[in-house]
Amino acid sequence: EHPTADRAGCSASGACYSLHHATMKRQAAEEACILRGGALSTVRAGAELRAVLALLRAGPGPGGGSKDLLFWVALQLPPGCGDPKRLPLRGFSWLSSDPGGLESDTLQWVEEPQRSCTARRCAVLQATGGVEPAGWKEMRCHLRANGYLCKYQFEVLCPAPRPGAASNLSYRAPFQLHSAALDFSPPGTEVSALCRGQLPISVTCIADEIGARWDKLSGDVLCPCPGRYLRAGKCAELPNCLDDLGGFACECATGFELGKDGRSCVTSGEGQPTLGGTGVPTRRPPATATSPVPQRTWPIRVDEKLGETPLVPEQDNSVTSIPEIPRWGSQSTMSTLQMSLQAESKATITPSGSVISKFNSTTSSATPQAFDSSSA
């Protein structure tokens, strides 16, 4: 039996990745990914590279980070005399094609691959201490690496439901992952939690012709709040709703809307019209690195064309960050769930509150999307 994923994560582009610690040959790694419904992962430039690096940096595997680890990826050199000078992959290529793919900002080679005209040759991703990616390393396909990376592709995902009053959240993804949080979940993912009074609740991500949503979820919240306010998706009290600048950082629970003062929630009908059953601050946050995090009702548009983004500094090992989402809030004050309120890429909010196209936007800032993905 194949072990469950040590870590996994999904981005709003529909791509999910899982990292597994298991000593096996390349062929066995390919089969293991296929059994999970995916394929051995490519690690191309840009968002994909950052996603995989984030998984690695989430924490060491077996051995506590004391040695270098080698992970099988979908990189190979077909039989025949490849050109070892062909930069940057030295003639190696990814198993699946991406006609528009750029390889310019790929990792370096730990050591130059040998020239060979006979056998198919494979390559691994070497991670220093098991967490810090060093680069590609040629490895004979029949040898055993320390682990492997899988990739899964979906047309649409379910953004994480807001907990509200829920506790003990648990995500079970279809690719055999049991996790404490996933910012984006593929169809088939089941989220279970406890509501107040220890009442269990379970919702499942389902996809149809309209898109993807959590069945049996009312108002985006797993468990309703006893009060009027939510902050970062969790129930909150009014005194906790002010940000560092004194702005209103909460949204109103279902049945309430933002009052005329712009910082209190009143019973629906007494204030102003609401959008999707929740009141949101009337103040439109500018799309800057230091602005408050917009609440969950902002629409998000997916993008895969990211500018260069800094990788996340020191984080708790149980949290994996994929830096593919807009820097809508200050990193230092964002909790895991706050980060899950945002989505991937260059979608930015304009002063009017609409979302700038991910595709022709020229902004390139991004905030990490975080999730705890300790395996069961």
Epitope: E155, I210, W214, P299
Partner: antibody
């Protein structure tokens, strides 16, 4: 920049055939579902066909009016979308657009929407 | 199939005027998308999932509705808003569009 450039349109006789192509660029084509939508001269928009991505087994869907006559297909390695049109009728005369099906996230849901349209290729069926 | 009926078919509005275009579905649909098309150009996604403005759409536009009744509203008409607007449902196959509402500047 996301683009879809259609080609292959032209004048064809009734019962004839035509193959439309759409060269997509600026996005990861193989992860998106795609559509063909047509617009007869001076008329409204009419959905023709949809093809999903590999992750959904390239499932295809058609408008009743084109079923068994038109075939939508794709070549992910070339980022190409196709529409094979057989047994053409005069009422098929229209501008044909290749359309990307984008995904938008709002709240805890994801929504499909036809978000990028090519410039269109004109098909005229006439004797 | 679900038939979408837009009204009015043609209308004109003066700058600053409030404009409402409605779309009625023959059966209940979950959401409605709206597209804008100007002569000689391809349609553009304008409002998705009933009420969300697509990229670059001015805030004077809004969308609302549920079930069989949906609408697109312009709070204050501007010259650049003159175009044809189409509603579209994707709750069931075949995907269908409304016949369009041509909005002219008075």
């Amino acid at each position: 920049e996301v683009q879809g450039v259609e080609s292959g349109g032209g004048l064809v006789q009734p019962k004839g055939s035509l193959k439309l192509s759409c060269a997509a660029s600026g996005f990861t084509f193989n992860t998106y579902a795609m559509h063909w939508v047509c617009q007869a001269p001076g008329k409204g928009l009419e959905w023709v066909a949809r093809i999903r991505s590999k992750s959904n087994n390239y499932a295809t869907y058609y408008a009743d009016s084109v079923k068994d006559r038109f075939t939508i297909s794709r070549d992910d390695s070339q980022s190409m979308l196709y529409l094979q049109m057989n047994n053409l009728k005069t009422e098929d005369t229209a501008m044909y657009y290749c359309v990307r099906e984008g995904v938008y996230y709002y709240g805890s849901s994801g929504y499909y929407a036809m978000d990028y349209w090519g410039q269109g290729t004109s098909v005229t069926v006439s004797s | 199939e679900i038939v979408l009926t837009q009204s009015p078919a043609i209308m004109s509005a003066s700058p600053g005027e409030k404009v409402t275009i409605t779309c009625s579905a023959s059966s209940s649909v979950s959401y409605m998308h709206w597209f804008q098309q100007k002569p000689g150009t391809s349609p553009k996604l304008w409002i998705y999932s009933t009420s969300n403005l697509a990229s670059g759409v001015p805030a004077r536009f809004s969308g609302s509705g549920s079930g069989t009744s949906y609408s697109l509203t312009i709070s204050r008409m501007e010259a650049e808003d003159a175009a044809t607007y189409y509603c579209q449902q994707r709750s069931s196959y075949p995907l269908t569009f409304g016949a369009g509402t041509k909005l002219e500047l008075k």
